[in-house]
């Protein structure tokens, strides 16, 4: 059986949209599928790689690579989006391309970044882990680490940094899919809101879905012990 809830939820573009949340109900009146997975049910994506889920993650990364920071012109906030989800009238889409990006390395002004910008994350202002020396962040935002410490200045002078962030990665459904959403939308979809991250590529949703012991490699499911747990 399915339980359908519909609600008007604020989406990334800044417009309210009627959204459906479909919950698979337990036929025997018991825990939901997500709870059963957390309790150690035999769920193959937690035991070994699932091709469908792998393709979903790759597709999400491809989209994220092309994203930019959508900054509302009225200073009400910013959110990482695709160009199509950033209003041409009410917002500014900050996306590095051609010569608009910062240099890859402070000491070499030649090669410029083309992947980015990312709301509230920039290799020029992150102090931990710093983008320098042998640890320069790649020109692919899906390979950026989580910045745990920003430079101590209140204002950076960068549009995508000096804005109030409105969306973060949200892990939705048992398939471990991720979307950058408002907290409101994430809660409605019964997702897990990652307050610490700026990009979906920085979180491992399947690890969150599976629970129990974290995967040794967050990209590779290894909970074969589920075969004995259930």
């Amino acid at each position: 059986a399915q339980h359908v809830t519909t609600q008007l939820v604020l989406r990334n573009k800044g417009v309210y949209e009627s959204v459906k949340y479909i919950q698979q109900e337990n036929f025997w009146i018991g825990p939901s599928s997500i709870d059963l997975i957390h309790l150690g049910a035999k769920f193959s994506p937690c035991i070994r790689k699932d091709q469908q889920i792998e393709q979903l993650v790759l597709r999400e990364r491809d989209l994220e690579r092309d994203s930019g920071c959508c900054v509302q012109n009225d200073h009400s906030g910013c959110i990482q989006t695709q160009r199509k989800d950033c209003s041409e009238t009410l917002a500014t889409f900050v996306k590095w391309q051609d010569d608009t990006g910062p240099p890859m390395d402070k000491s070499d002004l030649g090669q410029k970044r083309t992947s980015g910008a990312v709301c509230h994350q920039d290799p020029r202002t992150c102090e931990e882990p710093a983008s320098s020396g042998a640890h320069i962040w790649p020109d692919d935002i899906t390979k950026w680490p989580i910045c745990t410490e920003q430079a101590k200045s209140n204002r950076t002078g960068f549009l995508h940094m000096d804005c109030q962030i409105k969306g973060r990665p949200c892990c939705i459904s048992t398939k471990g899919s991720c979307e950058i959403t408002t907290r409101e939308y994430c809660e409605f979809m019964h997702g897990y809101f990652h307050e610490e991250a700026t990009l979906c590529s920085q979180v491992h949703c399947l690890d969150k879905v599976c629970g129990l012991l974290p995967f040794l490699n967050p990209e590779v499911p290894d909970q074969f012990y589920r075969l004995w747990l259930s």
Epitope: L8, K13, V15, Y16, E17, K84, E88, T89, L90
Partner: antibody, heavy 116, light 107 residues
Framework: QVQLQQSGAELVKPGASVKISCKAS????????MNWVKQRPGKGLEWIGQ????????KYNGKFKNKATLTADKSSSTAYMQFSSLTSEDSAVYFC?????????WGLGTLVTVSA | DVQITQSPSYLAVSPGETITINCRAS??????LAWYQEKPGKTNKLLIY???TSQSGVPSRFSGSGSGTDFTLTISSLEPEDFAMYYC?????????FGGGTKLEIK
């Protein structure tokens, strides 16, 4: 400058379908939402839906979901709207308009007359 | 869907006067209301969005105000070219909806 050139007036029979076009120029067609708006005399404006030519994503007004089909051809920078099972209620001027939340650029409209 | 009630539907005034057109939403739409001008043989023109933000190139005599459910378009010192049809549109939620229009004519 941005221009939206709409196809000419159509006279169609009840029950038939009609496909009208909107050719865009002066901007990157793939990067902006295209909307369709209906105007009947004395009835004001009604938003039908919008399409993002870059990936074909669409949003529809529920009222027109089974009536209108929005498509876009990136190679010719043209947006299309097909209206099916036409009745006299569908006689109207149909506008294409660029924008996501508000409509900055409009076409001049296409008059569709449904008559036996 | 959000219903938008626009008033008056018809207005006849003289050039140089100041007029106001009102739009009322059936529910709270925050500040997200736009105003358009329609003239025969010309493409529709966006005047104001987000309640009070003027679209670039729009003369300063056009101004918008309001939030929540009540909004106003004010045109001060009417010029001959301002006599036209005006519509409001909410852009707070899907589906976008329009007011019924106000016809502004020369007295």
């Amino acid at each position: 400058q941005v221009q939206l050139q709409q196809s000419g007036a159509e006279l169609v029979k009840p029950g038939a379908s009609v496909k009208i076009s909107c050719k865009a120029s002066g901007y990157t067609f793939s990067n902006y939402w295209m909307n369709w708006v209906k105007q009947r005399p004395g009835k004001g404006l009604e938003w039908i839906g919008q399409i993002y030519p870059g990936d074909g994503d669409t949003k529809y007004n529920g009222k027109f979901k089974n009536k209108a089909t929005l498509t876009a051809d990136k190679s010719s920078s043209t947006a299309y709207m097909q209206f099916s099972s036409l009745t006299s209620e569908d006689s109207a001027v149909y506008f294409c308009a660029r924008g996501d939340l508000v409509f900055v650029y409009w076409g001049l409209g296409t008059l569709v007359t449904v008559s036996a | 869907d959000v219903q938008i009630t626009q008033s008056p539907s018809y207005l006849a005034v003289s050039p140089g006067e100041t007029i106001t057109i009102n739009c009322r939403a059936s529910k709270n739409i925050r500040k997200y209301l736009a105003w358009y001008q329609e003239k025969p043989g010309k493409t529709n023109k966006l005047l104001i969005y987000s309640g009070s933000t003027s679209q670039s190139g729009v003369p300063s005599r056009f101004s918008g105000s309001g939030s929540g459910t009540d909004f106003t378009l004010t045109i001060s010192s009417l010029e001959p070219e301002d006599f036209a049809m005006y519509y409001c549109q909410q852009h707070n939620e899907y589906p976008y909806t329009f007011g019924g229009g106000t016809k502004l004519e020369i007295k």
